[in-house]
C-alpha cells in the first residue's frame, strides 16, 4: 500500500500510482473526479479532493488542479450531449447533417453536409460525420429524384408487380411511369396507377 | 436543474389548428436543439419536428410537413409548434426534447382530435 | 430515411437475468445512437449516448456497444426497477428516428 519506496522508479500499478522522484517513493494517484490536496511524503499518502463545480479530472492523476469544464459552441455547429460532470468533459457532437471540418484532438467545427442532386446519393462511408459527402450516381435500376444531403436511391417500381405495365422506363432522376394495360395513354403519376 | 414545462394541449376537431409551447429553463436554452416528439396512447416514441439552436433550420418528419410550423424564441427560452389540418393520426402526447441526443424531457401535453 | 430495427419487441426475464436487446439502423450511422428507458405515464430517460457512453447516475449493469449498423444494450443482472419499455435513437442525420421499442416484462 503507497507510499512505499521504489529504486527502479517504477510503481506496480501504474494507473493508479506515480513515482515521486524527491521521495523516491510511489504514491497514490487521485481518481477520477477528484485531484491533488496534499501531496504525499514518504509517511503519508496522497490526499484528494473532489473537483469543484464546473470542473473535472478525467484520469486517474496527480494534478493539483481540476480542468475547468467548457461549453460546445453552437456558432461551430457544435452541441452538447451529455453536460459536464466531475469525472467526464462537456461531451460535444456535430449537429445532425453536419460534418466535422476542423480538428485539433476532437472537432472544433463543423458544417452542414452538401446536398446530392437528383440522380445521386451520398457514399456510405466507414466513419459518419468524418467528412463532406461524396455523391455517386444511382446505380442501374434505381433514382433518386430530390437534393438533399442523406436521400439513398430507390429501385424503380416494377409494373408487373402491381398488374400494370410500362408506360415510360425510370431514370437515375426519375420513377418508372406505369399504366392500366387497357389504357393507351400513360398517365401523369409515377409509380403508380391513376384511377 | 434542467425543466421542460409543455402547453397548449387539448381536444380539436379533425382540419383544426393548435398551438404548443414548450418554456424551459436551467440550461442555455440558445446552446441547444429542440424537438417535439410524440407517443400515441400504447405506442412508441416517433419524433415530430426540431429546430437548430439558432432557429435557422427547420427540420421535420414527412407525415406533418406543411402541416405543422416549429418556431423558438431564444430570448424568452419558449418553443412552439403551431399544428393545422389536424387529422386523427395526429392524436398523442407531445413532448419538448433538449438536444439532438434527447438528453432532457418534458412530461407532455395531450393533443386529442376527434369529431 | 435511417430505420431503426429493434429486436425483440417484448422479452420475459427475472430479477437478476442478464438483458440483451438490439438495434440495427438500415445505414451507417457511426456512434450516433442513444438508448432511453420509459416506464408507464412517465417522460422517456436516457441511459447511454454515442452508442456506449453511460449517462450520469445510471447504474453500470446497463451497458452499450456497437457502431455503424449493429448496436447492442445489455443489462447484466436485471432488478426490479429495470422492468420497462427500451428505445434506440439514431441522431446521425435528420430525420431523427426510433426503433420500435422493446417491452422488458416480469417472467
Known amino acids: 500500500v503507497p507510499p512505499y519506496g521504489s529504486e527502479n522508479q517504477t510503481c506496480r500499478d501504474q494507473e493508479k500510482e506515480y513515482y515521486e522522484p524527491r521521495h523516491r517513493i510511489c504514491c497514490s494517484r487521485c481518481p477520477p473526479g477528484t485531484y491533488v490536496s496534499a501531496k504525499c511524503s514518504r509517511s503519508r499518502d496522497t490526499v484528494c479532493a473532489t473537483c469543484a463545480e464546473n470542473s473535472y479530472n478525467e484520469h486517474w492523476n496527480y494534478l493539483t488542479i481540476c480542468q475547468l469544464c467548457r461549453p460546445c459552441d453552437p456558432v461551430m455547429g457544435l452541441e452538447e450531449i451529455a453536460p459536464c460532470t466531475s469525472k467526464r468533459k462537456t461531451q460535444c457532437r456535430c449537429q445532425p447533417g453536419m460534418f466535422c471540418a476542423a480538428w485539433a484532438l476532437e472537432c472544433t467545427h463543423c458544417e452542414l453536409l452538401s446536398d446530392c442532386p437528383p440522380g445521386t446519393e451520398a457514399e456510405l462511408k466507414d466513419e459518419v460525420g468524418k467528412g463532406n459527402n461524396h455523391c455517386v450516381p444511382c446505380k442501374a435500376g434505381h433514382f433518386q429524384n430530390t437534393s438533399s444531403p442523406s436521400a439513398r436511391c430507390q429501385p424503380h417500381t416494377r409494373c408487373e408487380d402491381q398488374g400494370l405495365v410500362e408506360a415510360a422506363p425510370g431514370t437515375a432522376q426519375s420513377d418508372t411511369t406505369c399504366r392500366n394495360p387497357s389504357e393507351s395513354l400513360p398517365p401523369e403519376m409515377s409509380g403508380t396507377m391513376l384511377m | 436543474e434542467v425543466q421542460l414545462v409543455e402547453s397548449g394541449g387539448g381536444l380539436v376537431q379533425p382540419g383544426g389548428s393548435l398551438r404548443l409551447s414548450c418554456a424551459a429553463s436551467?440550461?442555455?436554452?440558445?446552446?441547444?436543439?429542440m424537438n417535439w416528439v410524440r407517443q400515441a396512447p400504447g405506442k412508441g416514441l416517433e419524433w415530430v419536428s426540431g429546430?437548430?439552436?439558432?432557429?435557422?433550420?427547420?427540420y421535420y418528419t414527412d407525415s406533418v410537413k406543411g402541416r405543422f410550423t416549429i418556431s423558438r424564441d431564444n430570448a424568452k427560452n419558449t418553443l412552439d409548434l403551431q399544428m393545422t389540418s389536424l387529422r386523427a393520426e395526429d392524436a398523442a402526447i407531445y413532448i419538448c426534447?433538449?438536444?439532438?441526443?434527447?438528453?432532457?424531457w418534458g412530461q407532455g401535453t395531450m393533443v386529442t382530435v376527434s369529431s | 430515411d435511417i430505420q431503426m430495427t429493434q429486436s425483440p419487441s417484448s422479452l420475459s426475464a427475472s430479477v437478476g437475468d442478464r438483458v440483451t436487446i438490439t438495434c440495427r439502423a438500415s445505414?451507417?450511422?457511426?456512434?450516433?445512437l442513444a438508448w432511453f428507458q420509459q416506464k408507464p405515464g412517465k417522460a422517456p430517460k436516457r441511459l447511454i449516448f454515442?452508442?456506449?457512453s453511460l449517462d450520469s447516475g445510471v447504474p453500470s449493469r446497463f451497458s452499450g456497444s456497437g457502431s455503424g449498423t449493429d448496436f447492442t444494450l445489455t443489462i447484466s443482472s436485471l432488478q426490479p426497477e429495470d422492468f420497462a419499455t427500451y428505445y434506440c435513437?439514431?441522431?446521425?442525420?435528420?430525420?431523427?428516428?426510433f426503433g420500435g421499442g422493446t417491452k422488458v416484462e416480469m417472467k
Open positions: 426534447a433538449q438536444g439532438f441526443a434527447f438528453t432532457n
Open positions: 436551467g440550461f442555455t436554452f440558445s446552446s441547444y436543439t
Open positions: 429546430v437548430a439552436p439558432s432557429g435557422d433550420r427547420t
Open positions: 445505414q451507417g450511422i457511426s456512434s450516433a
Open positions: 454515442d452508442a456506449s
Open positions: 435513437q439514431q441522431y446521425n442525420n435528420y430525420p431523427l428516428t
